[in-house]
């Protein structure tokens, strides 16, 4: 069959999902493209337990997640309901801050150095985390 039964090389298994943690940065859209080309998606955080797991692996580094409000309301990339789901924003965030001088507000969410979330300019080259569920699709490719 085509179902994935174990995580590929360099991915980490946790609670029936596979996670891949980048060590370099890309803009949110390009990180999203990377994950999709790998038959995955930017990480969707659905619980405090998953938050702690991801936070442990990324350390104190700004890191994109699969949450954005580029089309208005906040949305998770996999369709998980935002309003009723887990949230871990920093105090007074998200604030759609326009004062950065880069044009527009802040439409993409990332983990900050303490793990809590902030909205930021989507073009910033942050690290990112991909996630894919086991038993969903074919195995990911090995590395070059």
């Amino acid at each position: 069959g085509s179902e994935r039964t174990c995580c590929p090389v360099n991915w980490v298994e946790h609670e029936r999902s596979c996670y891949w943690f980048s060590r370099s940065g890309k803009a949110w859209a390009d990180a999203d493209n990377y994950c999709r080309l790998e038959d995955a998606h930017l990480v969707v955080v659905t619980s405090w337990e998953e938050q702690k797991f991801v936070q442990h692996h990324i350390g104190p580094v700004n890191t994109w997640m699969g949450l954005h409000d580029q089309n208005g309301p906040w949305k998770w990339v996999d369709g998980t309901d935002y309003e009723t789901g887990f949230k871990n924003w920093r105090p007074e965030q998200p604030d759609d801050w326009y004062g950065h001088g880069l044009g527009g507000g802040e439409d993409c969410a990332h983990f900050t150095d303490d793990g809590r979330w902030n909205d930021d300019v989507c073009q910033r080259p942050y690290r990112w985390v991909c996630e894919t569920e086991l038993d969903k699709a074919s195995q990911e490719p090995p590395l070059l």
């Epitope: 590929p8 980048s22 370099s24 790998e38 038959d39 490719p141």
Partner: antibody, heavy 122, light 107 residues
Framework: EVQLLESGGGLVQPGGSLRLSCAAS????????MSWVRQAPGKGLEWVSA????????FYADSVKGRFTISRDNSKNTLYLQMNSLRAEDTAVYYC???????????????WGRGTLVTVSS | EIVLTQSPATLSLSPGERATLSCRAS??????LAWYQQKPGQAPRLLIY???KRATGIPARFSGSGSGTDFTLTISSLEPEDFAVYYC?????????FGGGTKVEIK
């Protein structure tokens, strides 16, 4: 032997259609994203389209968006490019290429076919 | 989209000489840069990825360096089979883009 073999090229009139195929062998095809890259006669390389291993995600260059469709049949180890509304500027050698993934999060073309020539002319 | 500018367009050298090829990006691509070699009538071949890592089977005389916007491919001592066209390619931003190429020809 690890290889990619393109077919389906030929002469087609402007506005016409063509379907390219790429037969893969020697590696686990459905594990890898794949891509098409083209090269106009005497010119440089241009990325055209890419597809994830399962086929669930597809990507296109602006120059072909809405006209070309990339797909794959993993049971046949074959990649396809359906080209519609062809224009003279689509004339090129079309290469099928396997996308390798690096630790840093890059995608590069680590295996190429020999290419198939598509000529769009009346 | 990111524009990659390669220079020089043509490099005329003799076997045994050192070749230095440049690739400049219109904005930072971090280290998401690859180099390919293409000989007449053949498909391209991956030489270098992530700016400085040699692909499988590539001889040590090929090396890549740089990050951000400025990158270099160096061939330490040209062999007869190295005379070809070389392309750089970035995977920092969608769409993937290639440079216009540098032809290394026999002087």
């Amino acid at each position: 032997e690890v290889q990619l073999l393109e077919s389906g090229g030929g002469l087609v009139q402007p506005g016409g259609s063509l379907r390219l195929s790429c037969a893969a062998s020697g590696f686990t095809f459905n594990n890898y994203p794949m891509s098409w890259v083209r090269q106009a006669p005497g010119k440089g390389l241009e990325w055209v389209s890419a597809i994830s291993g399962s086929g669930s995600a597809t990507f296109y260059a602006d120059s072909v968006k809405g006209r070309f469709t990339i797909s794959r049949d993993n049971s046949k180890n074959t990649l396809y490019l359906q080209m519609n509304s062809l224009r003279a500027e689509d004339t090129a050698v079309y290469y099928c290429a396997k996308l390798g993934t690096t630790v840093s999060g890059g995608h590069y073309f680590d295996l190429w076919g020999r290419g198939t020539l598509v000529t769009v002319s009346s | 989209e990111i524009v990659l500018t390669q220079s020089p367009a043509t490099l005329s050298l003799s076997p045994g000489e050192r070749a230095t090829l440049s690739c400049r990006a219109s904005q930072s691509v971090s280290s998401y840069l690859a180099w390919y070699q293409q000989k007449p009538g053949q498909a391209p071949r991956l030489l270098i990825y992530d700016a400085s890592k040699r692909a499988t089977g590539i001889p040590a005389r090929f090396s890549g360096s740089g990050s951000g916007t400025d990158f270099t491919l160096t061939i330490s001592s040209l062999e007869p089979e190295d005379f070809a066209v070389y392309y750089c390619q970035q995977d920092s931003n969608h769409p993937l883009t290639f440079g216009g190429g540098t032809k290394v020809e026999i002087k």
